[in-house]
């Protein structure tokens, strides 16, 4: 049985940059069982976790992971040096910053050491798998009587990120959202001084330095509100 599975995952280019291959085997046996898919995410270009569902194996198996970079100076096969475990069974591998090369094709191979011919290889574009840390230090400035400006910081180069700002008042049932580019500034031109507002932001490694689909976690919310008393209409900022 010789299987090649093409699996587009939103990370494809003109040629698929993600595919699984299983080695041919002579008979239907354990060797023919597909290996779990490996999912890799690069966190803030500080480290990368490549994980798989170890519970999908018919019996507990310490699968091994090897990796290399295709057509590059880093094409030497490397063994995982830092495994992640789930109930004492390997379920992932963590790679450190020095082992991450964003713009080279990353090849990851999962193998069953008890059945060496049972292996699967995937090719990934790591620049499309970066997840930045959540935005920090949200601040609000009153530009005019009715206009607010929201600023924040990221622990990554600003020009590599785009952002999504969400805000709502205590009277709203849903969030209003606005996309913001690498300049990472957002202004709300019309603020009702009688309402309390909540703002939050998330960021994504797109479109300049990569084409990531996954957003960061949401920032801690920041609030801007009004005392209900008519005698004291001053606005104030509170960080949650």
């Amino acid at each position: 049985l010789n299987t090649t599975i093409l699996t587009p995952n939103g990370n494809e280019d003109t040629t698929a940059d993600f595919f699984l291959t299983t080695m041919p085997t002579d008979s239907l046996s354990v060797s023919t069982l597909p290996l779990p898919e490996v999912q890799c995410f690069v966190f803030n270009v500080e480290y990368m976790n490549c994980t798989w569902n170890s519970s999908s194996e018919p019996q507990p198996t310490n699968l091994t992971l090897h990796y290399w970079y295709k057509n590059s100076d880093n094409d030497k096969v490397q063994k995982c040096s830092h495994y992640l475990f789930s109930e004492e069974i390997t379920s992932g591998c963590q790679l450190q910053k020095k082992e991450i090369h964003l713009y080279q094709t990353f090849v990851v191979q999962l193998q069953d050491p008890r059945e060496p011919r049972r292996q699967a290889t995937q090719m990934l574009k790591l620049q499309n798998l970066v997840i930045p840390w959540a935005p920090e230090n949200l601040t609000l400035h009153k530009l005019s009587e009715s206009q607010l400006e929201l600023n924040w910081n990221n622990r990554f180069l600003n020009h590599c990120l785009e952002h999504l700002v969400q805000y709502r008042t205590d009277w709203d049932h849903s969030w209003t959202e606005q996309s913001v580019d690498y300049r990472h500034k957002f202004s709300l031109p019309s603020v009702d001084g009688q309402k309390r507002y909540t703002f939050r932001v998330r960021s994504r490694f797109n479109p300049l330095c990569g084409s990531a689909q996954h957003w960061s976690e949401w920032s801690h919310p920041i609030h801007w509100g009004s005392n209900t008393s008519k005698e004291n209409p001053f606005l104030f900022a509170l960080e949650a």
């Epitope: 713009y103 080279q104 180069l157 020009h159 479109p207 300049l208 330095c209």
Partner: nanobody, 117 residues
């Protein structure tokens, strides 16, 4: 061996224009975003602009936005920076770098831009 060779700098009057070029070799140029940075005398390295690998997205430092234009020709493995409406504060050594400008790898030799009347 990654090589980046900048050219096109020179002496120009305020309000003038220049076009900088960066010839790249030794890596898959079309796979990488590319960045221009500059270093004024006695100052640190300042990010100027970055362009996506396919040229479809660009970003600029606030100090140059609207005056500078980054572009690339992947067929020629060359990066460009068009400098218009130059100011004296644009005087610096200009470097191109592979990637998004995180400081690595080291920039090339650079090309000097001097804006003076």
């Amino acid at each position: 061996q990654v090589q980046l060779q900048e050219s096109g700098g020179g002496l120009v009057q305020p309000g003038g224009s220049l076009r900088l070029s960066c010839a790249a070799s030794g890596f898959s140029f079309s796979s990488y975003p590319m960045t221009w940075a500059r270093q004024a005398p006695g100052k640190g390295l300042e990010w100027v602009s970055t362009i996506a690998s396919d040229g479809g997205s660009t970003a600029y430092a606030a100090s140059v936005e609207g005056r500078f234009t980054i572009s690339r020709d992947n067929a020629k493995s060359t990066l460009y920076l068009q400098l218009n409406s130059l100011k004296t504060e644009d005087t610096a050594m200009y470097y191109c770098t592979k990637g998004y400008g995180d400081g690595t790898p080291a920039p090339g030799q650079g090309t000097q831009v001097t804006v003076s009347s």
